[in-house]
Interface confidence: low
């Protein structure tokens, strides 16, 4: 064999005995008839030698080290060559070593061509025997970044201040290229950055520097993961140890592009994030260790990349092509205060553009899918405007306020479906007629259904909330003077099962002056609770509302008010209540700002309750709660 090393190539070749074997017959390197067991060849030297045995690979190994100095001159960046060529070397287990020294401010990047690298732990070996051992440097201390095989995900490793790369090739391996190149980068301000690229499903096991020994004190190491947007990544820690910190805390930080809470900080003992969509970074940060009893920080973890589970593979069609003035938003439910990372939860349009919230508008058919570990973290809010601009066209026209079935079939809970009902001012009013009579939500008789209708004025300057109403009561219809919003709000997933109970029809009717009229047809044996609009804030100034209460022929109604006085104090005008029998037109008038409220009274025929407010002084608002109870007549008084 002849090995000739060019002058100033900075290459040293060393042939030495490998691990001792139990072979009886020794083997030597023969050079100029001398028998030696170690041969060193330096730059500019040419050596001819042979071996004294037929299978030198069982006895010797060869190390080829090239020193690359980036301190004093330009760096030879680009694809790294195997020098001397493997064809010129004896067939021994060989290790090519590149030792690159650079300034602290210079970043060095090793770029691995396909196949990329797979990190292995202590005691593991590579199937083909080809290993890459990479180490860095902190001042004078060598830090092992890791040992890697082929056929993995690691595509780039960035370091600064220097890098030592050792490529070990078994004697029988035909490889004749290094498989990597070196590039210079700006300072990375940390020990190293390892880039791991997933092109499809798969997993990668990675380790902190020096594993299984301790990670260098107060250092920072980052892994960058490149994951296709349609796949999910989950991180799990296979093994870790914490050192004894004197200052700062050991932690991992996740950086997810587009997240509003970067970086997400975790303790190593925390459950690590899963179901992340797209690229992310993970960083391990050490601490200042106790000098007397430092302990060790080490971490071995796995990243699993797979297709999203369950709902994520399904495509849902939301057909809003026949809708007008409607928008549907799928968004995260509000969560309070937790700084813990939660896996990404995304909704995707056409399976391509994924974001944490998505708004669909009417006039089109939309295909959506979900990338989310727990769809209960999302909800839907829908707004639809029904407006009438021409009173001649709209009068007596009716619209059904129902949640379209396409929306009900989505795997995300509906939170609010709001209809904004707009009428021409002073021309038309509205009447709401439910499929099932409604109950008004009160503290005394709360709604316990899976949904309610929230009815409020939609006039910007008017703060008027009529109340919350749910199926299963006695309110037959609600008439309102002007623009309102009706919001179907769900309170439980069981709304899907109860959806058939929803159903409200709105009709445009001739204009009337009262703010609202409730038509109440009580059922026997149940107490109906009714309260004035804007319960918590008080009926707005100069507002009038009425209740039309039906009493069947064979029943008597007991009307009961729940406090002695209304509590209202008028600044201007008077607040009053009129109770009027519908058949005889006989009426009682009560001054609400002066009189006590009436004692329980009995009504044998249908009657009106009308409440009109004054302009109250602040803090002395008009809030009234009353009930109507039907009992059978004991004596026929007709």
């Amino acid at each position: 064999f002849e090995i000739a090393l060019p002058r100033e190539s900075n290459i040293t070749v060393l042939i030495k005995l490998g691990t001792p074997t139990l072979l009886a017959k020794p083997c030597y390197i023969v050079i100029s008839k001398r028998h030696i067991t170690m041969l060193s060849i330096k730059s500019g030297e040419r050596i001819v030698f042979t071996f004294s045995c037929q299978s030198p690979e069982n006895h010797f190994v060869i190390e080829i080290q090239k020193n690359i100095d980036c301190m004093s001159g330009p760096c030879p960046f680009g694809e790294v060559q195997l020098q001397p060529s493997t064809s010129l070397l004896p067939t021994l287990n060989r290790t090519f070593i590149w030792d690159v020294k650079a300034h602290k401010s210079i970043g060095l990047e090793l770029q691995f061509s396909i196949p990329r690298l797979r990190q292995i732990g202590p005691g593991e070996s590579c199937p083909d025997g080809v290993t890459h051992s990479i180490s860095g440097r902190i001042d004078a201390t060598v830090v092992r970044i890791g040992t890697f095989c082929s056929n993995g995900t690691v595509s780039r490793i960035k370091m600064q201040e220097g890098v030592k790369m050792a490529l070990h090739l078994p004697w029988f391996h035909p490889r004749n290229v290094s498989g990597f190149s070196i590039a210079n980068r700006s300072s990375i301000k940390r020990l190293c950055i390892i880039e791991s690229v997933f092109e499809g499903e798969g997993s990668a096991t990675l380790m902190s520097a020096n594993y299984p020994e301790g990670f260098p004190e107060d250092e920072l190491m980052t892994w960058q993961f490149v994951v296709p947007a349609h796949l999910r990544a989950s991180v799990s820690f296979l093994n870790f140890n914490l050192s004894n910190c004197e200052r700062k805390e050991e932690r991992v930080e996740y950086y997810i592009p587009g997240s509003t809470t970067n970086p997400e900080v975790f303790k190593l003992e925390d459950k690590q994030p899963g179901n992340m969509a797209g690229n992310f970074n993970l960083s391990l940060q050490g601490c200042d260790q106790d000098a007397q009893s430092p302990g060790i920080l080490r971490l071995q973890f796995q990243v699993l990349v797979q297709h999203p589970q369950n709902e994520s593979n399904k495509i849902y069609v939301v057909d809003l092509s026949n809708e007008r003035a409607m928008s549907l938003t799928i968004e995260p439910r509000p969560v309070k205060q937790s700084r813990k990372f939660v896996p990404g939860c995304f909704v995707c349009l056409e399976s391509r553009t994924c974001s944490s919230n998505l708004t669909l508008t009417s006039g089109s058919k939309h295909k959506i899918s979900f990338l989310c570990d727990d769809l209960t973290r999302l909800w839907m809010n829908v707004e639809k405007t029904i407006s009438c601009t021409d009173h001649r066209y709209c009068q007596r026209k009716s619209y059904s306020l129902q949640v379209p079935s396409d929306i009900l079939h989505l795997p995300v809970e509906l939170h609010d479906f709001s209809w904004k009902l707009l009428v021409p001012k002073d021309r038309l009013s509205l009447v709401l007629v439910p499929a099932q009579k409604l109950q008004q939500h009160t503290h005394e008789k709360p709604c316990n259904t899976s949904f309610s209708y929230l009815v409020a004025s939609a006039i910007p300057s008017q703060d008027l909330y009529f109340g919350s109403f749910c199926p299963g009561g006695s309110i037959k219809q609600i008439q309102v003077k002007q623009n309102i919003s009706v919001t179907l709000r769900t309170f439980a997933p069981s709304f899907q099962q109860e959806a058939s109970r929803q159903g409200l029809t709105v009709s445009f009717i001739p204009y009337f002056k009262e703010e609202g009229v409730f038509t109440v047809t009580p059922d026997t044996k149940s107490k109906v609770y009714l309260r004035t609009p804007n319960w918590d804030r008080g009926l707005p100034s100069l507002t009038s509302v009425s209740w039309n209460i039906s009493v069947p022929r064979d029943q008597v109604a007991c009307l009961t008010f729940f406090k002695e006085r209304s509590g209202v104090v008028c600044q201007t005008g008077r607040a009053f209540m009129i109770i009027q029998e519908q058949r005889t037109r006989a009426e009682e008038i009560f001054s609400l700002d002066e009189d006590v409220l009436p004692k329980p009274s009995f009504h044998h025929h249908s009657f009106w309750v009308n409440i009109s407010n004054c302009s109250p002084t602040s803090g002395k608002q008009l809030d009234l709660l009353f009930s109507v109870t039907l009992t059978p007549r004991t004596v026929d008084l007709t």
């Epitope: 301000k189 509003t260 809470t261 970086p263 900080v265 205060q337 937790s338």
Partner: antibody
Framework: QVQLVQSGSELKKPGESVKVSCKAS????????MHWVRQAPGQGLEWMGW????????TYADDFKGRFVLSLDTSVSTAYLQISSLKSEDTAVYYC????????????WGQGTLVTVSS | EIVLTQSPATLSLSPGERATLSCRAS??????LHWYQQKPGQAPRLLIK???QSISGIPARFSGSGPGSDFTLTISSVEPEDFAVYYC?????????FGQGTKLEIK
């Protein structure tokens, strides 16, 4: 309206303890995190830590671990800062402030409590 | 931890002039930076959130720029009531840190 009202000034001797209160009104205490900030005489602002008002879990900056304790009494909508083994360098104005969102900006502040430690 | 460096330490201006206050972070902190104003004997007051978002009730002459690691608070035309100390605050990661402050004084 939202208000954070802190307890009055305190004069303490080294080695003693002090407990500063911060009463929240005009909003639900548990809907926002509560943070504490120190300002030594003539100096800048130092973030001390925060308390998760839903769980009561405190988090401290490194320089405020050990002698400083953040606590809460939701029944009276009040957050507390207790400092034990007082030192002269603890002389400062201590502010409580309400944290908004996950990456807090402090939209409401208490008026501050001056704690003076002198022998 | 994120170190915030404010400059200048003191800025002397006359009313009506434009004030430019700088805050530099030791690393990129996206837009997780807020600005506060503090007058003697008072608690700080939030001026700008998330680098450039305005706060209700704060005059429009206050504006901020970002994101990244270099941030600026600009007062387009300084009013007499604007003379105070201004602090930037990082909300990027624990611990939340403040800059050392810039004092805006009357020239």
């Amino acid at each position: 309206q939202v208000q954070l009202v802190q307890s009055g000034s305190e004069l303490k001797k080294p080695g003693e303890s002090v407990k500063v209160s911060c009463k929240a009104s005009g909003y639900t205490l548990t809907d926002f995190s509560m943070h504490w900030v120190r300002q030594a005489p003539g100096q800048g602002l130092e973030w001390m830590g925060w308390i998760n008002t839903e769980t009561g879990a405190p988090t401290y900056a490194d320089d405020f671990k050990g002698r400083f304790v953040l606590s809460l009494d939701t029944s009276v909508s009040t957050a507390y800062l207790q400092i034990s083994s007082l030192k002269s360098e603890d002389t400062a104005v201590y502010y409580c402030s309400r944290g908004r969102d996950y990456d807090p900006h402090f939209d409401y502040w208490g008026q501050g409590t001056l704690v003076t430690v002198s022998s | 931890e994120i170190v915030l460096t404010q400059s200048p330490a003191t800025l002397s201006l006359s009313p009506g002039e434009r004030a430019t206050l700088s805050c530099r972070a030791s690393q990129s902190i996206s837009d997780f930076l807020h600005w506060y104003q503090q007058k003697p004997g008072q608690a700080p007051r939030l001026l700008i959130k998330y680098a450039s978002q305005s706060i209700s009730g704060i005059p429009a002459r206050f504006s901020g720029s970002g994101p990244g690691s270099d941030f600026t608070l600009t007062i387009s035309s300084v009013e007499p009531e604007d003379f105070a100390v201004y602090y930037c605050q990082s909300a990027h990661s624990f611990p939340y840190t403040f800059g050392q402050g810039t004092k805006l004084e009357i020239k």
